[in-house]
C-alpha cells in the first residue's frame, strides 16, 4: 500500500514525498512565508493614513513579491512537466502493472497538488491587488506632497522678496529718522529758546507796565502844574511879540548855505548821487576821522555800509581789541570796519541790520534786525537787537539780551573759557553763543566738525563753517 | 548756571590709555549731543569725536579711529572719553562741548603724552 506523507524541509518549503513500492516520488512547493495571508493584519485599508507608508519599503516590497510570483510561476511551469513527464511514466507502469489504486492516488496527488497551486495562486493575486492599490494611493500622495511643496515653496519667494522689500524701506525709513533726529533737536532747542525769550520780555513788560502805571499818577499829578505853567508862558510869549513889533532893529535872514562834501553813511552816499557799488569814505558829524567803507548800493533799495565781510580767508581776524576798534582788513574784499566808528553811528539815529550768510552748498540765508546799535567802549561795544526776521532762523543766533564784545586779549564773555582764544576772532560771545561770523575760514570739504569756524547756529548748526558772511547797516527810515 | 567740568587729565607714556570724564550740570544733558574737543599747544581747536543725545551714534576723526571710544551716562549727565594706544601727537587740552546753541564749553583737561 501507497504511503503518502506531507513535511517542511530545512528551507521551508512544503515536501510532498509519495512512496510506491520501490518508487518514491518527493514534490518540493515554495511557502510564501514573507507573504502575508488574507489573515494577516495586513489588510487592505492599511494605507488608509494621513502620512504615507517609506516610499522605498513599498518598492522593496513590491520587488519581492514579483520574484517570488516569478520563481511560482516557473515552479509550476516545472511541476506540470515534471507531472506530464512522471504521469506517462506512470500511465505505461499502470497499464502494464493493471494496478488500478495506483491510478487513483496519482489522480489524488495530482488533484492535491491543483488545489494547492491553485490556492497559491489565488493567494498571489489578492497580494497583488493589495501592493497595486497601496502603490497607486501612494503615488498619488506623493502627487499631492510634490504639489504642497510646490505651492509652499512659491509662497516661502513670494514672502522672501516681500521681506526683501521691507528691508530696502526699513533702511531707507531709518536714513530719513536719523537726518529728522537732528532737525528735530534743533526745532526743539529753537522752541525753548523762544519761550525763555517770551518769559523775558514777558517779565521785562511787566515791570515796564508797572513803572507806567506810576508815571501815569505821576502825570496826573504835574497836569495841573504844567497847565498853570503853559498860561504863564503864553502871557510871556505874548508881551513878547508886543516888544518885538514895537522895536525899530532890522536883521539880514540870509545865511550861506555850505554844500555837503562828507557822509556820515552809504545812506547819504546813495542819497547824493553816486549809487554805484564800491569804496567810500564816510566821516562821523563833527568829526574829522575818515573811513573808508564799502557801500552796497545795489541789494535791497542799496544805501547799505558794509561792517564786516568774510569771503576766502585772505584776512586774519584773530585781532586784539584795538584792531577791533579802528577797524582792519580790505573794505573790497574781507574787513571789519571798526567798533567806535560803528558805535558812534547807530548811536545817533536808528540803524537796521542786516546779516547776509552762504554756505558751501550755493544756498543763501540772511538774518534782518529792524533796530541795531553798539553801545561805547565803556559798556565794551555790546550789542543791542530787536526785531527779528528772515531766512536764516527764526531766532536770534547773536544771543539775547545782547553780550559785551570779546577779543583774545580781553575776555569779557561769560564762560568759564575764553571764548575768543578757544573759538577765535573778536565777536559779542556768551558762553559762548550761537553765532562767530568772525571765526577760522575753513575752505570746501573742511568746513564741518569745526567748532572755531564761521558759526551762525540757527542756520547750519554749530559745526558747519559758512563761505561767507557780510554784515549791513542802514537807517531804519531809509 | 551752566557748567562742564572736565577731569581725568595727567601724563602718561606712548601707548597708554586715560579716560576723561565730563560732569554737566544747569542744562538738559540727555537733550543735546556731546563732543570732545581738542586744542594742541599753538594750535587751532581740532574736533575729536562727537555722541547723539541717546548714546547711539558716534562719530570720530580719522586721527583717533579705533584708538579712542566716546560714551555718555545720561542718569548721572556725565559724558567720557577713553582713550587707548596714545601718541605723542595726542597731547594737547580736551574740551568737552554740548551741541547746544550756547555751545556751552569746560575749562578743559590737560594731556600730555611723553616718555
Known amino acids: 500500500y501507497n504511503n503518502f506523507r506531507k513535511s517542511m524541509d530545512s528551507i521551508g518549503k512544503k515536501q510532498y514525498q509519495v512512496q510506491h513500492g520501490s518508487c518514491s516520488y518527493t514534490f518540493l512547493l515554495p511557502e510564501m512565508d514573507n507573504c502575508r495571508s488574507s489573515s494577516s493584519p495586513y489588510v487592505s485599508n492599511a494605507v488608509q493614513r494621513d502620512a504615507p507608508l517609506e516610499y522605498d519599503d513599498s518598492v522593496q516590497r513590491l520587488q519581492v513579491l514579483e520574484n517570488i510570483m516569478e520563481n511560482n510561476t516557473q515552479w509550476l511551469m516545472k511541476l506540470e512537466n515534471y507531472i506530464q513527464d512522471n504521469m506517462k511514466k506512470e500511465m505505461v507502469e499502470i497499464q502494464q502493472n493493471a494496478v488500478q489504486n495506483q491510478t487513483a492516488v496519482m489522480i489524488e496527488i495530482g488533484t492535491n497538488l491543483l488545489n494547492q497551486t491553485a490556492e497559491q495562486t489565488r493567494k498571489l493575486t489578492d497580494v497583488e491587488a493589495q501592493v497595486l492599490n497601496q502603490t497607486t494611493r501612494l503615488e498619488l500622495q506623493l502627487l499631492e506632497h510634490s504639489l504642497s511643496t510646490n505651492k509652499l515653496e512659491k509662497q516661502i519667494l513670494d514672502q522672501t522678496s516681500e521681506i526683501n522689500k521691507l528691508q530696502d524701506k526699513n533702511s531707507f525709513l531709518e536714513k530719513k529718522v536719523l537726518a529728522m533726529e537732528d532737525k528735530h533737536i534743533i526745532q526743539l532747542q529753537s522752541i525753548k529758546e523762544e519761550k525763555d525769550q517770551l518769559q523775558v520780555l514777558v517779565s521785562k513788560q511787566n515791570s515796564i507796565i508797572e513803572e507806567l502805571e506810576k508815571k501815569i499818577v505821576t502825570a496826573t499829578v504835574n497836569n495841573s502844574v504844567l497847565q498853570k505853567q503853559q498860561h504863564d508862558l503864553m502871557e510871556t510869549v505874548n508881551n513878547l511879540l508886543t516888544m518885538m513889533s514895537t522895536s525899530n532893529s532890522a536883521k539880514d535872514p540870509t545865511v550861506a548855505k555850505g554844500e555837503q562834501i562828507s557822509f556820515r553813511d552809504c545812506a547819504e552816499v546813495f542819497k547824493s548821487g553816486h549809487t554805484t557799488n564800491g569804496v567810500y569814505t564816510l566821516t562821523l558829524p563833527n568829526s574829522t576821522e575818515e573811513v573808508k567803507a564799502y557801500c552796497d548800493m545795489e541789494a535791497g533799495g542799496g544805501g547799505w555800509t558794509i561792517i564786516q565781510r568774510r569771503e576766502d580767508g585772505s584776512v586774519d581776524f584773530q585781532r586784539t581789541w584795538k584792531e577791533y576798534k579802528v577797524g582792519f582788513g580790505n573794505p573790497s574784499g574781507e574787513y571789519w570796519l571798526g567798533n567806535e566808528f560803528v558805535s558812534q553811528l547807530t548811536n545817533q539815529q536808528r540803524y537796521v541790520l542786516k546779516i547776509h550768510l552762504k554756505d558751501w552748498e550755493g544756498n543763501e540765508a540772511y538774518s534782518l534786525y529792524e533796530h541795531f546799535y553798539l553801545s561805547s567802549e565803556e559798556l565794551n561795544y555790546r550789542i543791542h537787537l530787536k526785531g527779528l526776521t528772515g531766512t536764516a532762523g527764526k531766532i536770534s543766533s547773536i544771543s539775547q539780551p545782547g553780550n559785551d564784545f570779546s577779543t583774545k586779549d580781553a575776555d569779557n564773555d561769560k564762560c568759564i573759557c575764553k571764548c575768543s582764544q578757544m573759538l577765535t576772532g573778536g565777536w559779542w560771545f556768551d558762553a559762548c553763543g550761537p553765532s562767530n561770523l568772525n571765526g577760522m575760514y575753513y575752505p570746501q570739504r573742511q568746513n564741518t566738525n569745526k567748532f572755531n569756524g564761521i558759526k551762525w547756529y540757527y542756520w547750519k548748526g554749530s559745526g558747519y563753517s559758512l563761505k561767507g558772511t557780510t554784515m549791513m547797516i542802514r537807517p531804519a527810515g531809509f | 548756571e551752566v557748567q562742564l567740568v572736565e577731569s581725568g587729565g595727567g601724563l602718561v607714556q606712548p601707548g597708554g590709555s586715560l579716560r576723561l570724564s565730563c560732569a554737566a550740570s544747569?542744562?538738559?544733558?540727555?537733550?543735546?549731543?556731546m563732543s570732545w574737543v581738542r586744542q594742541a599747544p599753538g594750535k587751532g581747536l581740532e574736533w575729536v569725536s562727537t555722541?547723539?543725545?541717546?548714546?547711539?551714534?558716534?562719530g570720530y576723526a580719522d586721527s583717533v579711529k579705533g584708538r579712542f571710544t566716546i560714551s555718555r551716562d545720561n542718569s548721572k549727565n556725565t559724558l567720557y572719553l577713553q582713550m587707548n594706544s596714545l601718541r605723542p601727537e595726542d597731547t594737547a587740552v580736551y574740551y568737552c562741548?554740548?551741541?547746544?546753541?550756547?555751545?556751552?564749553w569746560g575749562q578743559g583737561t590737560t594731556v600730555t603724552v611723553s616718555s
Open positions: 544747569g542744562f538738559t544733558f540727555s537733550s543735546y549731543a
Open positions: 562741548n554740548a551741541d547746544h546753541p550756547q555751545g556751552y
Open positions: 555722541i547723539n543725545s541717546g548714546g547711539g551714534r558716534t
